[in-house]
């Protein structure tokens, strides 16, 4: 999670603000070692499909679940805030039986009115035998999935089936797709916002509307900020992810809802069932679709996708392949930036953003998606930095 893509050696952790490396034992120890203090504000994460709250222990140099003993909602809100979620997004906290854990972080209630992490200490016991599960935002819930769902080879989507899907317009024309992750933040592809389209004033986001012809100016949300991944490579499409912040927050309803960002510890399986959606062309070199379409695809393991007869080592760890090697179903022009989602525990997770491919729906040329799992830390950092 935190340590992915770091240029420090295995034992070091990189400061965002200066690029310097610090010792893991100095991370989350209550003292700022990075110039921007980020070694003390990235000490919390949600783990696995049950959203188990974990805190980094500088003593043990590892992550540990938080014991439910003496925990309350206020601590939950503080933890979510530290991840980059706003207070008013907070959804709920729950408890998960975690008898499998042998190492916990516990609250020292007598520690007084200090920072939450200064109240936590390492313990091998947890009397409640339960750990904290946190939902920082009510995400990943839809009304009804699509029928066997044109992208290329799909079908038109049902209302509320993909409520996180947005259409991103430039001068009243659909250019890319995107995914809602909070009322203010949209995930899209970096190649969508290459210069000169890196200016936010170019962009309007439309949410909850299935038909392009209903997307008139007044129903859209103006974009306030565009943040492209700093390591995006326009030639190879490596790190093809970007964030858009909206000027006004979206109002969530049955048709407009966020998708969940994947948590560390969520294992993706080869052949795992996923869905893609968008207003992209329904055939190669076709024009943008009037209606939102969706299609089922399967994850294709990177080793296979990198084989000589598929993409011959063009797939990096920041990419995921999905589709069918026989072709027929795929994302296409105009779907870029849109979601690749999968369902686990009845929750929909954003595991990819539509990035590139050779043609559309061709045999041995599956779709390639940004691997959102690799970018979650970067996403939370942007949300946190924006305050």
């Amino acid at each position: 999670w935190k340590f992915m893509g770091s240029k420090c050696s295995n034992s070091g952790i990189e400061c965002d603000s200066s690029g310097t490396c610090i010792n893991p034992s100095n991370w989350c120890d209550g003292v700022s070692h990075c110039p921007g203090g980020e070694d003390e504000n990235r000490c919390v994460r949600l783990y696995g499909p049950n959203f188990i709250l974990q805190v980094y222990s500088s003593q043990r140099k590892s992550w540990h679940p938080v014991c439910q003993d003496d925990w309350n909602e206020n601590y939950g809100r503080a933890a979510c805030r530290d991840m980059g979620y706003k207070n008013n997004f907070y959804s709920s906290q729950g408890i998960v039986d975690d008898s499998g854990s042998t190492s916990f972080m516990k609250l020292n209630t007598s520690a007084g009115n200090v920072d939450i992490y200064k109240k936590l200490y390492h313990s091998d016991a947890c009397s409640s035998k339960a750990v904290v599960s946190l939902r920082c935002i009510a995400c990943g819930v839809n009304l009804n999935s699509s029928r066997q769902s044109r992208i290329v080879g799909g079908e038109s989507a049902l209302p509320g089936a993909w409520p996180w899907q947005v259409s991103l317009h430039v001068q009243n024309v659909h250019v890319c797709g995107g995914s809602i992750i909070t009322p203010e933040w949209i995930v899209t592809a970096a190649h969508c916002v290459e210069k000169p389209l890196n200016n936010p004033w170019h962009w309007t986001a439309f949410a909850g509307i299935l038909r392009q012809s209903f997307m008139f100016y007044g129903a859209g949300y103006q974009v306030e900020k565009v943040i492209s991944h700093p390591n995006y490579d326009s030639k190879t499409k490596n790190n093809d992810i970007a964030l858009m912040k909206l000027q006004k927050p979206l109002t969530f309803n049955d048709l407009v809802k966020p998708v969940c960002l994947p948590n560390p510890g969520m294992m993706l399986q080869p052949e795992q069932l996923c869905w893609i959606s968008g207003w992209g062309a329904t055939e190669e070199k076709g024009k943008t679709s009037e209606v939102l379409n969706a299609a089922k695809v399967l994850l294709i393991e990177t080793q296979r996708c990198n084989s000589r007869y598929v993409y011959d080592n063009l797939i990096t760890p920041a990419m995921i392949c999905a589709g069918f090697l026989q072709g027929n179903v795929d994302s296409c022009q105009g779907d870029s930036g849109g979601p690749l989602v999968t369902s686990k525990n009845n929750i929909w997770w954003l595991i990819g953003d539509t990035s590139w491919g050779s043609g559309c729906a061709k045999a041995y040329r599956p779709g390639v998606y940004g691997n959102v799992m690799v970018f979650t830390d970067w996403i939370y950092r942007q949300m946190r930095a924006d305050g």
């Epitope: 038109s156 012809s213 049955d254």
Partner: antibody, heavy 121, light 111 residues
Framework: QVQLQQPGAELAKPGASVKLSCKAS????????MHWVKQRPGQGLEWIGL????????NYNEKFKSKATLTVDKSSRTAYMQLSSLTSEDSAVYYC??????????????WGTGTTVTVSS | DIVLTQSPASLAVSLGQRATISCRAS??????????MHWYQQKPGQPPKLLIY???NLESGVPVRFSGSGSGTDFTLNIHPVEEEDAATYYC?????????FGAGTKLELK
């Protein structure tokens, strides 16, 4: 059940303005756009415009752009239409109607009861 | 704007017979596999009531004697067999794009 309630009648003088209301109940207010339709006595239906309760930015029929102003109050789940500079041509029944913008369809599945506006000195 | 022309303007039909109302659009209202044409019934002093959506789909609670057909620019509403309560004005409406527009209406009377 799903309802759109409108006052039965409004009387106004020429040159004046009138503000019509449409109170929604029985559904998620922000999941539907609210449209307004005019019907002159013995005449057909004329689309005035729509307002998305989410963003509050309206879309109008060119013919009514300087005549009608659409607004919403999300807290009271009420849509409003103000008609200005009234003339006898504005005497009509005005309906609000909801439109499920999230479906592909674009039909009016629920209509208000209608408000009869009479412009007379 | 798309103009919808309904015909006839009025028609009188005997009880139990078939009523056929036509609606022609100035340009195609079909795209992406859908025909964005809808039909409404309006009785005096009442708001319009949705009968048929997407050219041929019967709205729930509407009797099966009402049916719709057509695609592109030509659409038809059929009522068979006509019953007494069907005396009303019928309107077509498109939603191919904004603005949506209505036909001028067809008044159905019973002989």
């Amino acid at each position: 059940q799903v309802q759109l309630q409108q006052p039965g009648a409004e009387l106004a003088k020429p040159g004046a303005s009138v503000k019509l209301s449409c109170k929604a109940s029985g559904y998620t207010f922000t999941s539907y756009w609210m449209h307004w339709v005019k019907q002159r006595p013995g005449q057909g239906l004329e689309w005035i415009g729509l307002i998305p309760p989410n963003s509050g930015s309206s879309n109008y029929n060119e013919k009514f752009k300087s005549k009608a102003t659409l607004t919403v109050d999300k807290s009271s789940r009420t849509a409003y239409m103000q008609l200005s500079s009234l003339t006898s041509e504005d005497s009509a029944v005005y309906y609000c109607a909801r439109w499920d913008y999230g479906s592909s369809y674009g039909y009016f599945d629920v209509w208000g009861t209608g408000t009869t506006v009479t412009v007379s000195s | 704007d798309i103009v919808l022309t309904q015909s006839p303007a009025s028609l009188a039909v005997s009880l139990g017979q078939r009523a056929t109302i036509s609606c022609r659009a100035s340009e195609s209202v079909s795209t992406s596999g859908y025909s964005y044409m809808h039909w409404y019934q309006q009785k005096p002093g009442q708001p319009p009531k949705l009968l048929i959506y997407l050219a041929s789909n019967l709205e729930s609670g509407v009797p099966v004697r009402f049916s719709g057909s057509g695609s592109g620019t030509d659409f038809t509403l059929n009522i068979h067999p006509v019953e007494e309560e069907d005396a009303a004005t019928y309107y077509c409406q498109h939603s191919r794009e904004l603005p949506p527009t209505f036909g001028a209406g067809t008044k159905l009377e019973l002989k």
